[in-house]
């Protein structure tokens, strides 16, 4: 070994080395929450940059760069460090046009933290162990959330657009010149039937148990789905969409409620299999993947 | 295509009866309202009754007590006429808001028209 790669061993060795890095890590992520940070701290941005390119060149020095097996750029933790660095010269030296949208991986320079601190590494790596487990456990999720948003798109495609309308139109009027002229809240409101303090029309459907529309109103399927066009079955993203929100119990049982109203509580049973099937039993598989990973990883 | 074919129409003296029918031809999802109008020569077209599937019906005030509107299980809607007068000549039309699939939305079709004649 040269001297030169003996004293970086020594000093990337050494524990006083490990404290500096984690103190500048640390005192670069107080900087890095200033909202208007004062003009002297660019010097200080330099510091940093200069620490964290010495803390490189040190072990870059020590391990080699990359042609051994344990040379800098084999542990991943290091592609961290070296992205860092390359971006802060990138920010500062190259004029590349939007610079706010790199200045954003700074922000990685927090990650930094993980690798110096040893518990830390160990989680995040347990944690890493874990989405590689999960693989199986998310195709099969995707593909049951998939089959199900299927079967929701054959039953459900349209039905949420049902609303319930006024009777009363005028001699000349047809539902497609209303809908052409409707155009605030206001407007709607004076044609659709609302419930207080309700953003959408009243749901309703066509078969004899799903939600009937009050005296004077008539059940049409036209204009929007409700939530401002967001819930709905009418295709299969948004299908997947709705199954998802069900499986991670988002506000279900109002997404329940508006389908079951426009479709019939005869579908009830569509959700109740959806909720054992997605919410109680793959939520519960994704945790137990996890929670073995972890397990595994503390041994 | 979705059509709508009245039918019924004719003279008729005064005091007389007529029966008008309008069936949907085609195919047809849903059938929401089922509505009567009538132009009269030289002026607008009014409304003169509706059904609806819940059963709500309701009639212009100048045929209320005469005419009466009803619809069977198929895609039919009748119009039953009763003691008419000359002022009820007019051209009368069929108007359905329906559903031709249960993938289209809501919309509103005409019939052709039925000519009631009211004289002596």
């Known amino acids: 070994f040269s001297p030169l790669r003996r004293i970086s061993i020594k000093i990337l060795v050494h524990s006083l080395f490990s404290m500096l890095i984690m103190c500048t890590i640390l005192t670069n992520c107080i900087f890095m929450t200033m909202n208007n940070p004062p003009d002297w701290t660019k010097n200080v941005e330099y510091t940093f940059t200069g620490i964290y390119t010495f803390e490189s060149l040190v072990k870059i020095l020590a391990r080699g760069f990359c042609v051994g097996e344990f040379t800098f750029l084999r542990d991943p933790w290091n592609w961290l460090d070296f992205v860092v660095i390359v971006f802060a010269y990138l920010t500062e030296f190259v004029n590349l046009g939007n610079v706010s949208a790199l200045r954003t991986f700074r922000v990685l320079r927090a990650l930094k933290t993980i690798s110096v601190i040893p518990g830390l590494k160990t989680i995040v790596g347990a944690l890493i162990q874990s989405v590689k487990k999960l693989s199986d456990v998310m195709i099969l999720t995707v593909f049951c959330l998939s089959v199900f948003a299927l079967i929701g798109l054959q039953l459900f495609m349209g039905n949420l657009k049902h609303k319930c309308f006024r009777n009363s139109l005028e001699n000349n009027e047809t539902l497609e010149s209303i809908m052409n002229t409707l155009e605030s809240e206001e407007d709607f409101r004076k044609y659709f039937y609302y419930l207080e303090g309700s953003k959408d029309a009243l749901l309703c459907g066509f078969s004899t148990d799903s939600g009937q529309c009050p005296e004077g109103y008539t059940c049409v399927k036209i204009g929007r789905n409700p939530d401002y066009g967001y819930t709905s079955f009418d295709t299969f993203s948004w299908a997947f969409l709705a199954l998802f929100r069900l499986m991670t119990q988002d506000y279900w049982e109002n997404l329940y409620q508006q389908t079951l109203r426009a479709a019939g509580k005869t579908y009830m049973i569509f959700f109740v299999v959806v909720i054992f099937l997605g919410s109680f039993y793959l939520i519960n598989l994704i945790l137990a993947v996890v929670a073995m990973a972890y397990e595994e990883q503390n041994q | 295509e979705v059509q709508l074919v009245e039918s019924g129409g004719g003279v008729v003296q005064p005091g007389g009866s007529l029966r008008l029918s309008c069936a949907a031809s085609?195919?047809?999802?849903?059938?929401?309202?089922m509505a009567w109008y009538r132009q009269a020569p030289g002026k607008q077209r009014e409304l003169v009754a509706y059904?609806?599937?819940?059963?709500?019906i309701s009639y212009a005030d100048s045929v209320k007590g005469r005419f009466t509107i009803s619809r069977d299980r198929s895609k039919r809607v009748y119009l039953q006429m009763n003691s008419l007068r000359p002022e009820d000549t007019a051209l009368y039309y069929c108007?359905?808001?329906?559903?031709?699939?249960?993938?289209?939305?809501?919309?509103?079709?005409w019939g052709q028209g039925t000519l009631v004649t009211v004289s002596s």
């Open positions: 059904v609806t599937p819940t059963g709500d």
């Open positions: 085609g195919p047809v999802f849903n059938i929401n309202r």
């Open positions: 108007r359905a808001l329906l559903q031709p699939d249960r993938y289209s939305n809501t919309r509103t079709y």
